[in-house]
Amino acid sequence: AGVFELQIHSFGPGPGPGAPRSPCSARLPCRLFFRVCLKPGLSEEAAESPCALGAALSARGPVYTEQPGAPAPDLPLPDGLLQVPFRDAWPGTFSFIIETWREELGDQIGGPAWSLLARVAGRRRLAAGGPWARDIQRAGAWELRFSYRARCEPPAVGTACTRLCRPRSAPSRCGPGLRPCAPLEDECEAPLVCRAGCSPEHGFCEQPGECRCLEGWTGPLCTVPVSTSSCLSPRGPSSATTGCLVPGPGPCDGNPCANGGSCSETPRSFECTCPRGFYGLRCEVSGVTCADGPCFNGGLCVGGADPDSAYICHCPPGFQGSNCEKRVDRCSLQPCRNGGLCLDLGHALRCRCRAGFAGPRCEHDLDDCAGRACANGGTCVEGGGAHRCSCALGFGGRDCRERADPCAARPCAHGGRCYAHFSGLVCACAPGYMGARCEFPVHPDGASALPAAPPGLRPGDPQRYL
């Protein structure tokens, strides 16, 4: 167990041109607050996936009113740290989302209004117990400077907060095999005793007496490799005998969601759908009012004037959840064509197109002749899933826009010399050859392989190819 701590140092215009307009004005004074969302691992998770490591909301910053004509300065910040407690081991690698929200304090009907100013995200490696790490992130024209660290809560210590410390029983030294607990030298590392017989290779424990299995292993002591085949029934026979995967306690067993929240299993863990008035990973955060700004992603908060009355978040299209924190999976309708990859960014859908396709939904096939213009009289030829332009004489390139060197392909046979000409090319044939490409030998008796030389041309004269 431990706490992730985030300290916001500044939020203001970033360097470079195009400074953002101040988010507040004399007519609409405002104040800032921040939200942080943490997820384990380095995976590129969508913004709406649960904050499995936890989330936190800052206090409100001081009220700010823009000075007319002045550039937007760094905006006044809330006091204090954002703290995200974690109950289990610190994962070492994590993803974060930090949102900067603006609360407008003008004469809005129904109280203050919230809007998202900036969202930054990143993936980092961090050992618990280490020093503060500094970071700068940019979102559009805004820049956010912050520091963060993870620290263990006693008695946990170590880079993952999994080792336990206990006060020394003897003043001088720790017991056999136990080290002093740096930095708490007056304490000793407590042995973390897993269940007797728990496999040291395939099992581990975070609490004394338990035996949790690594992926691919099962059984009470994590000694049985998982095999999903040869099960006699959907649940399979005893894992101890066959190694069949017997579902152990599911993540929703015993319902980890507090305050009447409903639990649904996810591929990695579980997710709680909280009743109104509660939020957090396990619906454990309560007493929230609209003044706390519980509705994310532009949701409108109604009711909840005091902690005893529940608030309701009216979510904008595309968002859901009791706090509008979850995005509807629009990509499930597969709007991207031609094998494009769908990305739901919240404010818009984006398609990452496969090679050869373009357009907002990958609807334009770049490899066909439909709507394809070949310049300078060229014609489009399809074939093999690709297209090419067959160019008129004197032109080349993908779209026939380049002037071609007609002599580049050495078209004149038998040593004939090629001359470029505005209407094409001309071959000056070597003695003994004739024809537009010098392809015909002149017979010794003066007769040619051609029926007759064109009028006005003698064998050996340059032959113009039109």
Epitope: G318, L333, Q334, P335, G340, P360, R361, C362, E363
Partner: nanobody, 120 residues
Framework: EVQLVESGGGEVQPGGSLRLSCAAS????????MGWYRQAPGKQRELVAG???????KYAESVKGRFTISRDNAKNTVYLQMSSLRAEDTAVYYC??????????????WGQGTLVTVKP
Amino acid sequence: EVQLVESGGGEVQPGGSLRLSCAASGSIFSINAMGWYRQAPGKQRELVAGFTGDGMTKYAESVKGRFTISRDNAKNTVYLQMSSLRAEDTAVYYCAADVFTDRDHVDWYWGQGTLVTVKP
């Protein structure tokens, strides 16, 4: 702007049938993808059935063989024929459409939803 108007919801007994309609209107250049999502109380909004961007039909596993989606391109309308209805099909059904408003601009639109209640 594009509007999606759903109709056909109501209350029905288990095993019964309903037909939902969704008509798109407004500044439509072409409809890229269109379908039905549903949201039961306390649950996530999920895709029920739809026509993908490539024109294929797609169904949620839980409704395969019971629900059929169809469309009338001339009317910019999709239909969801629901039969063998079960209590777990109770939800608000939302129409969704991914619409080109001109050749190079596309946006996602939701309808207001129509309630389907299945109870004995």
